[in-house]
């Protein structure tokens, strides 16, 4: 177990032309806060995939109001580190996403009070217990300077926080005739991991998960001093070597403390000492909870059903992501039918319909012939979002208003001669041919 720590040094306009002056203005003061998301291995840095190693949300920074005419400074930052506790081994390679959020402090009618200013992501190799690593990342016109490290929570040590260290036995605990004890120093029993909560002073292990007590101590975690009267007692099973009672199952057996918490027995039950970022009777509650306001853009926070998911965000229409931080491209779902043009106005979706269609999603096919008359006995034919006239013989054009020359298309075959007639056309066929169009 251990903690990933992130220290933001500065956030402000990057070098070069086109850099923004400030995300805040004299008219609209604002403050910044940060979110970090960690994933094990060199995985894709997709913002919506789960932060399997953990996530943290900073406090809000001081309020900043831009001074007109003044050079753009680095913006005031929240105090303190962002800390992401991890309960298992530190993976060594990890991916991170750091988001810079702006909270607008004016009354923004029609717009969210939060907006994502910048998102930087990267993949790094990092050994636990090493020095702070410094980094500079640019996102668009913004520049973020930060440091990070992974450190193990005692008694864990090592580059992956998987080795447990305990002090050697003090000289006074050595029995007569036994080899002299080594001076008090850290002794790493790699790769042994004793039972969580096993007393570092009075306990040790030779197998993973066990907790064996030095002489004079008992209990599942070697925290209970043995009084001489309890030895060689007829009650309960006794140890062949000491004659002292072998403890039965205790409240800390199986370690009820989640998320790397260590268990200690109390007179009535047990107590968990939780790593940073977790709390609750069994350290089951994650550092980021509903009380931190983790859901953006008007989302609602719902307490998680299981201890590993401390909260779930219920996002309003138009937003998605584990924190409702992503605006949905609602036009990508192609909601406008019949070739309508989709417009996402933020607060609403609009469809601009082609001629002949109507409705919020262009779903209604209008009666193209309504109010449309075809002249000279033509009949209206509906279709394709526009009306069309089927004209009587001798007439043409969109509305059958133009007198047509029925002979223009040379309808008489085999050299027949065409004559226009009030009822249409007449073909005078060449010798040897017959039919309305001299086709026979």
């Amino acid at each position: 177990a251990g903690v990933f720590e992130l220290q933001i040094h500065s956030f402000g306009p990057g070098p070069g032309p086109g850099a923004p002056r400030s995300p805040c203005s004299a008219r609209l003061p604002c403050r910044l806060f940060f979110r970090v998301c960690l994933k094990p291995g060199l995985s894709e840095e997709a913002a919506e995939s789960p932060c399997a190693l953990g996530a943290a949300l900073s406090a809000r920074g001081p309020v900043y109001t831009e001074q007109p005419g003044a050079p753009a400074p680095d913006l005031p930052l929240p105090d303190g580190l962002l800390q992401v506790p991890f309960r298992d081994a530190w993976p060594g390679t990890f991916s991170f996403i750091i988001e810079t959020w702006r909270e607008e402090l004016g009354d923004q009618i029609g717009g969210p009070a939060w907006s994502l200013l910048a998102r930087v992501a990267g993949r790094r190799r990092l050994a636990a217990g090493g020095p702070w690593a410094r980094d500079i990342q640019r996102a668009g016109a913004w520049e973020l300077r930060f440091s990070y490290r992974a450190r193990c929570e005692p008694p864990a040590v090592g580059t992956a926080c998987t080795r447990l260290c305990r002090p050697r036995s003090a000289p006074s605990r050595c029995g007569p005739g036994l080899r002299p004890c080594a001076p008090l120093e850290d002794e790493c029993e790699a790769p042994l991991v004793c039972r969580a909560g096993c007393s570092p002073e009075h306990g040790f292990c030779e197998q993973p998960g066990e907790c064996r007590c030095l002489e004079g101590w008992t209990g599942p975690l070697c925290t209970v001093p043995v009084s001489t009267s309890s030895c060689l007692s007829p009650r309960g099973p006794s140890s062949a070597t000491t004659g002292c009672l072998v403890p039965g199952p205790g409240p800390c057996d199986g370690n009820p403390c989640a998320n790397g918490g260590s268990c200690s027995e109390t007179p009535r039950s047990f107590e968990c000492t939780c790593p940073r970022g977790f709390y609750g009777l069994r350290c089951e509650v994650s550092g980021v909870t509903c009380a931190d306001g983790p859901c953006f853009n008007g989302g609602l926070c719902v307490g998680g059903a299981d201890p590993d998911s401390a909260y779930i965000c219920h996002c309003p229409p138009g937003f998605q992501g584990s924190n409702c931080e992503k605006r949905v491209d609602r036009c990508s779902l192609q909601p406008c039918r019949n070739g309508g043009l989709c417009l996402d106005l933020g607060h609403a979706l609009r469809c601009r319909c082609r001629a002949g269609f109507a409705g919020p999603r262009c779903e209604h096919d209008l009666d193209d012939c309504a109010g449309r008359a075809c002249a000279n006995g033509g009949t209206c034919v509906e279709g394709g979002g526009a009306h069309r006239c089927s004209c009587a013989l001798g007439f043409g054009g969109r509305d059958c208003r133009e007198r047509a020359d029925p002979c223009a298309a040379r309808p008489c075959a085999h050299g027949g001669r065409c004559y226009a007639h009030f009822s249409g056309l007449v073909c005078a066929c060449a010798p040897g041919y017959m039919g309305a169009r001299c086709e026979f």
Epitope: R60, E103, L105, G106, D107, Q108, I109, G110, G111, P112, A113, C290, A291, D292, G293, P294, C295, F296, N297, G298, G299, L300, C301, V302, G303, Y311, C313, P316, C324
Partner: nanobody, 130 residues
Framework: QVRLVESGGGSVQAGGSLRLSCETS????????MAWFRQAPGKEREGVAS????????YYADSVKGRFTISQDNAKNTVYLQMDSLKPEDTAMYYC???????????????????????WGQGTQVTVSS
């Protein structure tokens, strides 16, 4: 489905009292900032009071401080707005709203603005006559 149900509105003489209720589900109640807004005809919707049921101090707009009290009943997943010493200018449609907020931000004027909230009740009318 998100459910916010207001009740308790009505007509009252100036100087009188009313108590509005806003009931929601237990999944939403306690995990979110609960706020009361009001909207008078022809005016913007304004924040009146807010509370984070899981803890923290309540917030009141200056116009209602000392006259309105926001409270909660955890067993009923309900937030109340006790309105005393009512004035004609308190006449408005009153709405209950909820959203994810930190406990601290729930108690700020900048937090309790219309644009910060996406989930609303249907509203209850309060009319104060002189």
């Amino acid at each position: 489905q998100v459910r916010l149900v207001e009740s308790g509105g009505g007509s009252v003489q100036a100087g009188g009292s009313l108590r509005l209720s806003c009931e929601t589900s237990r999944y939403i109640y306690g995990n979110n900032c609960m706020a009361w807004f009001r909207q008078a005809p022809g005016k913007e919707r304004e924040g009146v009071a807010s509370i984070y049921p899981a803890g923290g101090r309540p917030y009141y707009a200056d116009s209602v401080k000392g006259r309105f009290t926001i409270s909660q009943d955890n067993a009923k997943n309900t937030v109340y707005l006790q309105m005393d010493s009512l004035k004609p200018e308190d006449t408005a449609m009153y709405y209950c709203a909820a959203r994810s907020f930190s406990i601290a931000d729930c108690a700020t004027q900048s937090g309790i603005t219309r644009s910060n909230f996406a989930y609303w009740g249907q509203g209850t009318q309060v009319t104060v006559s002189s």
